[in-house]
């Protein structure tokens, strides 16, 4: 059975008496080899009580002395087997062995849980020689133990390629429970059960768990760690923590807030970034997400004209990047715009409505009923049309642009005329005889030039050449109807 020492035990003196077989009386070590500082802790365990020989790894030397007596087997003396102490206390333990003087260069190494302890550990080896044997004491001290010091410590000594291993010394560092898993903050659906987990370890074990919800204990009796709390559902935010208890005391986990998912708050600060004739770019600041990520947003657009039928256009978009270009709007129109966003619970209310206007655009249709005829007496071409519908002018009409293309014997010339907005007729001089004149008309607003009407052709019979201004871009020929007068 292993021997066990608790920290309440009175410390032994380091060297209570001479080693068996030792002739030395002053016990002053011949040689002391500190591996690190020689701190003397409050708690020490002496390895020097004489005991039965080590039953573990034993080296039996083959060499005999002058009298030819075989040497006894080499083994570490027994020491305390189990040391229990509290965190941050100091501890010192040691291994001792008597080695015949015929062996040179004996070194003792310390090992913990199968790994050699190297570097700046508080290890000291002391040698006490006499006539036949040298007593070697290897001490190991830890000034302030931590949980990581828990484990099984052994001494190893090499002699003649033989390895001598001591019995293990088990160090058990006890302290308050240590959390290995704590509850995590969560966002949960209202009235829906969910789980929280708490796990803590010693030593000492067992560790018992109490759950606390909003300062009230959930379980009246302790539950063994680990513990899973099934919360039967919440209607409002709650704070949870767990208490871990062992014989050393109590550790309380961090408190975690469990939030109830709700519909988002409405977006704020809807603003106009840019307006064109047929589109408005808006941005918004999302409201509080209700503890659930936004999924998408809906832009609602109403015509602000009191005479409109009040229908609402809805445009759906992703929640990011809080920006949307509303398209297919009428030019020079007023709109009310609101934004609503949704999460897994539902839609927010609509943001405060804002007013926005589209700008003037180029007309969307061409003048209608274009007619062209030749006035031979004045050598002019008369053009007449009807102005496009007001709705489709997309702005205030400032005039018309007339394109007339003259084609004759492979030569093509385009001329452009600007006409004021008041009329719906124009007269252009014949530029070439024995030629085809193709006429197209576009309405013009401050927003730009609208589409040209379908081409109308008229043939001008031979009469003689007339000088004309330099031509503009050639127009492609086409098979549109020709009007001959």
């Amino acid at each position: 059975a292993i021997t066990e020492a608790r920290e309440e035990a009175k410390p032994y003196p380091l060297f209570p008496g001479p080693f068996p077989g030792s002739l030395q009386t002053d016990h002053t070590p011949l040689l002391s080899l500190p591996h690190a500082s020689g701190y003397q802790p409050a708690l020490m365990f002496s390895p020097t009580q004489p005991g039965r020989p080590h039953t573990g790894n034993v080296a039996i030397p083959q060499v005999t002395s002058v009298e030819s007596k075989p040497l006894p087997p080499l083994a570490f003396k027994h020491t305390v087997g189990h040391i229990i102490l509290s965190e941050h206390k100091g501890v010192k333990f040691n291994c001792s062995i008597s080695v015949p003087n015929i062996y040179q260069d004996t070194t003792i190494s310390w090992w913990k849980d199968g790994k050699e302890l190297l570097g700046a550990h508080h290890a000291i080896t002391q040698f006490y020689p006499d006539d036949e044997v040298t007593a070697i004491i290897a001490s190991f001290s830890i000034t302030s133990v931590q949980r990581s010091d828990n484990g099984s410590y052994i001494c190893k000594m090499k002699i003649n390629n033989e390895e001598i291993v001591s019995d293990p010394i088990y160090i058990e560092v006890q302290g308050l429970p240590h959390f290995t898993k704590q509850p995590e903050s969560m966002n949960v659906t209202r009235n829906t059960a969910f789980n929280l987990t708490c796990q803590a370890v010693g030593p000492p074990e067992p560790v018992n768990i109490f759950w606390v919800q909003n300062s009230s204990r959930v379980n009246e009796q302790p539950e063994k760690s680990p513990s899973v709390l099934t919360v039967p559902g919440l209607t409002e935010m709650a704070v949870f923590s767990c208490e871990a208890h062992n014989d050393k005391g109590l550790t309380v986990s961090k408190g975690v807030q469990i939030n109830i998912k709700a519909i988002p708050s409405p977006p704020t600060e809807v603003s106009i970034r840019n307006s064109t004739a047929h589109s408005i770019l808006i941005s918004w600041v999302p409201g509080f997400d209700g503890y659930s990520p936004f999924r998408n947003c809906s832009i609602q657009v109403k015509e602000a004209d009191p005479l409109s039928n009040g229908s609402v256009m809805i445009f759906n978009t992703s929640a990011l990047p809080h920006l949307y270009q509303i398209k297919q709007l009428q030019a020079l129109a007023n709109y009310s715009i609101g934004v609503s966003c949704m999460n897994e619970i539902g839609w927010s209310a609509v943001s405060p409505w804002i007013l926005a206007s589209t700008t003037e655009g180029a007309p969307s249709v061409a003048p209608l009923n274009v007619t062209v005829f030749l006035n031979e007496s004045s050598d002019n071409v008369d053009i007449r049309w009807m102005k496009p519908p007001t709705k489709q002018q997309d702005g205030e009409l400032v005039g018309y642009r007339i394109s007339h293309v003259w084609q004759s014997a492979g030569i093509s010339k385009e001329l452009l005329e600007e006409v004021g907005q008041n009329g719906s007729r124009a007269r252009i001089s014949v530029q070439v005889h024995n030629a085809t004149c193709t006429v197209r008309i576009a309405a013009v607003t401050r927003g730009g030039v609208g589409p040209f009407s379908d081409p109308v052709k008229i043939f001008i019979p031979a009469h003689g050449w007339v000088d004309y201004a330099p031509s503009s871009t050639p127009a492609p020929g086409n098979a549109d109807p020709v009007l001959i007068i």
Partner: antibody, heavy 118, light 106 residues
Framework: QVQLVQSGSELKKPGASVKVSCKAS????????VHWVRQAPGQGLEWMGW????????TYAQGFTGRFVFSLDTSVSTAYLQISSLKAEDTAVYYC???????????WGQGTLVTVSS | EIVLTQSPATLSLSPGERATLSCRAS?????MHWYQQKPGQAPRPLIY???NLASGIPARFSGSGSGTSYTLTISSPEPEDFAVYYC?????????FGGGTKVEIK
């Protein structure tokens, strides 16, 4: 299956003592507290307190301190309610119940009628 | 201590007529439990933690509420549902019961 079986009815004289037992079966006794609830004739339920079966520590509601004692014999998975110096107003049905999380009483004994009469 | 007030004290209903029982707490509580008791019997767990049906309880029973106001509803009471119903709070010691609501046949 979980069961709480209480001792039988008692007729006592004022000033006497009574000990009501509540034997648990079908679960690990030390894992759940035992609550005691009183119901006077024609009245509602009144929580008297509970005993921690893990540590043996009792908790008493106001009005149930002094003459009322909760105790345990864990070797036989039994909780006890002892009332000393009985008075007429102690006449009631006494229930034991198993307590789980959130102080919910999920299993109840059948009740023990204690009658105090001279 | 938290005082629980149940209303009405008595509820007279015809079978099938919806029953709504109220339990008000003198201060906010975390959860409310409900128990049913018939004459000469021990209380029977009905609803755990405000809205969770106890084992074997039919779905015509439901619970709701939060803060200081809690409700037990029997959507269409059967003859065996005529009994006394008690609420019990979880939040702070001492655990307290309401005074009870008796549901009787009209």
């Amino acid at each position: 299956q979980v069961q709480l079986v209480q001792s039988g009815s008692e007729l006592k004289k004022p000033g006497a003592s009574v000990k009501v037992s509540c034997k648990a079966s079908g679960y690990t006794f030390a894992n759940y507290g035992v609550h005691w609830v009183r119901q006077a004739p024609g009245q509602g339920l009144e929580w008297m307190g509970w005993i921690n079966t893990y540590q043996g520590e009792p908790t008493y509601a106001q009005g149930f301190t002094g003459r009322f004692v909760f105790s345990l014999d864990t070797s036989v998975s039994t909780a006890y309610l002892q009332i000393s110096s009985l008075k007429a107003e102690d006449t009631a049905v006494y229930y034991c119940a198993r307590g789980v999380r959130y102080a919910y009483m999920d299993y109840w004994g059948q009740g023990t009628l204690v009658t105090v009469s001279s | 201590e938290i005082v629980l007030t149940q209303s009405p004290a008595t509820l007279s209903l015809s079978p099938g007529e919806r029953a709504t029982l109220s339990c008000r707490a003198s201060s906010s509580v975390g959860y409310m439990h409900w128990y049913q008791q018939k004459p000469g019997q021990a209380p029977r767990p009905l609803i755990y933690a405000t809205s969770n049906l106890a084992s074997g309880i039919p779905a015509r029973f439901s619970g709701s509420g939060s803060g200081t106001s809690y409700t037990l509803t029997i959507s269409s009471p059967e003859p065996e549902d005529f009994a006394v119903y008690y609420c019990q709070q979880w939040s702070s010691n001492p655990r307290t019961f309401g005074g009870g609501t008796k549901v009787e046949i009209k």
